[in-house]
């Protein structure tokens, strides 16, 4: 099945903003929202935002977790919100990569 | 509760090893990724090494790269810290740390004192 | 590498006091930044995570505030048990902490 081609004039939609790009802002505008975990020498770094340009969230999105990051992507308003990218998890799809709890 | 008891430290001359452990008891230590952090005599704080849950990838600063190495066994909940090479400016008490994914090092050890002097 | 600096580097308080440490980082570390506290002879403690986070068991008269550059450390009503060296930590990139603040009381 093709990609989904981007409309003339693409839905936007308001996603929340969490992370260095974010400014001093909470929220921002794209065409997809996504949740992301980066892990930084050795350390979780959480992040929430928007994508403005649909390739940019076209890459990104498709791209498969691996041990040191993880990004989660949907469309609509505020669908980011409720998402926390993990890792992969041990023995599932993606061998050598690790599995986290919070507990 | 969460337990952490490091060993290990004592006094070394400059240039020797030592090997520092951390014994891990009362959350499930084969999920978590693990630290190490120092303290000179008066001092304030540095991150020295992270492990991942499998140990498979490894984090050092700059200035221990290549002397030091974190490692786990997780059969034993055990974290090591292989110190080689060691300079004065090691001289430290050395903390075992551990973070959950949202809280970084949220729990730490009492910590053991690395002397290094001639 | 990110650098961290506090002040004061020491803070003469008295009991009941409200008293507010600065942590600062030299570039935009979001929120990724935690408070810790050590007192005389033991390990440091978590106080808050990810700025603004009280660490369960630490009483509410702790808070902290800040985002990208410039971060804070509120004592709303100072205790003798709050007598210590905090510490801020940041872990958005090259984990470094904080140089320290004594806090003492007066």
């Known amino acids: 099945m093709e990609d989904e081609k981007p409309k003339v004039n693409p839905k936007l939609y308001m996603c929340v903003c969490e992370g260095l790009s974010c400014g001093n802002e909470d929220h921002c505008e794209g065409q997809q929202c996504f949740s992301s975990l980066s892990i930084n020498d050795g350390f979780h770094v959480y992040q929430k935002g928007c994508f403005q340009v649909y390739e940019q969230g076209k890459m990104t999105c498709k791209t498969p977790p691996s041990p040191g990051q993880a990004v989660e992507c949907c469309q609509g308003d505020w669908c980011n919100r409720n998402i926390t990218a993990q890792l992969p998890t041990k023995g599932k799809s993606f061998p050598g990569t690790q599995n986290f709890h919070l507990e | 509760e969460v337990q952490l008891v490091e060993t290990g430290g004592g006094l070394v001359q400059p240039g020797r090893s030592l090997k520092l452990s951390c014994v891990a008891s009362?959350?499930?230590?084969?999920?978590?990724?693990m630290y190490w952090i120092r303290q000179a005599p008066g001092k304030g704080l540095e991150w020295i090494s992270s492990i991942n849950t499998d140990g498979g990838s490894t984090y050092y600063p700059d200035s221990v790269k290549g002397r030091f190495a974190i490692s786990r066994d997780n059969a034993e909940n055990t974290v090591y810290l292989q110190m080689n090479s060691l300079r004065s400016e090691d001289t430290a008490t050395y903390y075992c740390?551990?973070?959950?994914?949202?809280?970084?090092?949220?729990?730490w050890g009492q910590g053991t004192l690395v002397t290094v002097s001639s | 590498d990110i650098q961290m600096t506090q002040s004061p580097s020491l803070l003469s308080a008295s009991v009941g006091d409200r008293v507010t440490l600065s942590c600062k980082a030299s570039?935009?570390?979001?929120?990724?930044l935690n408070w810790f506290q050590q007192k005389l002879g033991e390990a440091p403690k978590l106080l808050i995570y990810?700025?603004?986070s009280l660490q369960t068991g630490i009483p509410s008269r702790f808070s902290g505030s800040g985002s990208g550059t410039d971060f804070t450390l509120t004592i709303s009503s100072l205790q003798p048990e709050d007598v210590a060296i905090y510490f801020c930590?940041?872990?958005?990139?090259?984990?470094?902490f904080g140089p320290g603040t004594k806090l003492e009381l007066k």
């Open positions: 740390a551990k973070s959950t994914p949202n809280i970084p090092l949220a729990y």
């Open positions: 930590f940041q872990y958005s990139s090259g984990p470094t």
């Open positions: 009362g959350f499930t230590f084969s999920n978590y990724y």
């Open positions: 990810y700025s603004n």
């Open positions: 570039q935009n570390i979001y929120k990724y």
